[in-house]
């Protein structure tokens, strides 16, 4: 039975320009985490592998940053970059546990973030 | 103490394959991964691959996936690396290293196992 | 692959002074770069790990520093146990590779 919640940073917005650091945690299990993907609709932004390490998407490599921990952070934000973005996390036993995280990037600098939410 | 002890020096001619060991102490064997690392002629060393004691699971730097095998006996808390098709340019000290889960650095390393590749 | 190119590959020095090793990847690996000592006939041993933070048991002589593609690894006051070849490692993400090394020998 999966009993983890992820924890993400919500509905979040940012400046045109500037960065975000996308942050998923996943709690209330024991399971063993083995690989976090990071995607934007449908496409892969990075994958962090706990044998393997890192790695981001060609297409993304130069907006794209690894950490803070199993975290992302995205740079030189353009308003294209507004959407959801998923954390999907491997674990052992109990499977995969997915977390949304809308982003809007805002012309102006009235960016503010949301407050925390939790999917089961 | 965390400890990697490996297997004693071998001497094999050219052609045929080699199996060293590397028998953990002091810690969960399932709870670190195992990596093999190449040192030849005590310059430089080359990841040779990695394998995950608790899911069985192998990653191979490209240049070493037609050398090594990598394997795991729990019983006895021991990582394998066979070598086959042995050439002289495999002559080198080989290290069995542990990483940590999402740690992608070697805080323990074995002893170190001398092959000798010669007919 | 990361290519891991380090320098000097050999300095000479004397106990007392302070050395700088350096180490440049092909390309960013923001801060996951390890560094190892190791000594004649014996194994690597882990120093520093995401390019600052010392291992277990290392005196605080080390230091390292560095992001993206530009590293160090400063030792304050050496001692005569310094001696010996460094490497360093990105820990970014497969394949792992090490610098060539540098040998720091006793002047």
């Known amino acids: 039975m999966m009993t983890g919640t992820i924890e993400t940073t919500g509905n979040i917005s940012a400046e045109k320009g500037g960065s975000i650091i996308l942050q998923c945690h996943l709690s209330s299990t024991t399971a063993q985490v083995t690989q976090v993907n990071w995607e934007q609709q449908d496409q892969l932004l990075a994958i962090c592998n706990a044998d393997l390490g890192w790695h981001i998407s060609p297409s993304f490599k130069d907006r794209v940053a690894p950490g803070p921990g199993l975290g992302l952070t995205l740079q030189s934000l353009t308003v294209n970059d507004t959407g959801e973005y998923f954390c999907i996390y491997h674990t052992y036993p109990d499977g995969t546990y997915t977390g949304r995280i809308f982003l809007e990037v805002l012309e102006s600098s009235v960016a503010e973030h949301g407050a925390r939410f939790q999917i089961p | 103490e965390f400890q990697l002890q490996q297997s004693g020096p071998e001497l094999v001619k050219p052609g045929a394959s080699v199996k060293i060991s590397c028998r953990a102490s002091g810690y969960s064997f399932t709870a670190y991964s195992m990596n093999w690392v190449q040192q030849t002629n005590g310059k430089s060393l080359e990841w040779i691959g990695v394998?995950?004691?608790?899911?069985?699971?192998?990653n191979y730097n490209q240049k070493f996936k037609d050398k090594a095998t990598l394997t795991v006996d729990h019983s006895s808390s021991a990582a394998y690396m066979q070598l086959n098709s042995l050439t002289s340019e495999d002559s080198a000290v080989y290290f069995c290293a542990r990483n940590g889960n999402f740690a992608w650095y070697f805080d323990v390393w074995g002893t170190g196992t001398t092959v000798t590749v010669s007919s | 692959d990361i290519q891991m190119t380090q320098s000097p590959a050999s300095l000479s020095a004397s106990v007392g002074e302070t050395v700088t090793i350096t180490c440049r990847a092909s390309e960013s690996i923001f801060s996951y770069l390890a560094w190892y000592q190791q000594k004649q006939g014996k194994s690597p041993q882990l120093l520093a790990y995401n390019a600052e933070t010392l291992a277990e048991g290392v005196p605080s002589r080390f230091s390292g520093s560095g992001s993206g593609t530009q590293f160090s690894l400063k030792i304050n006051s050496l001692q005569s146990e310094d001696f010996g070849i460094y490497y360093c490692q990105h820990h970014f993400g497969v394949p792992w590779t090490f610098g060539g090394g540098t040998k720091l020998e006793i002047k």
């Open positions: 394998i995950n004691p608790k899911f069985g699971t192998i």
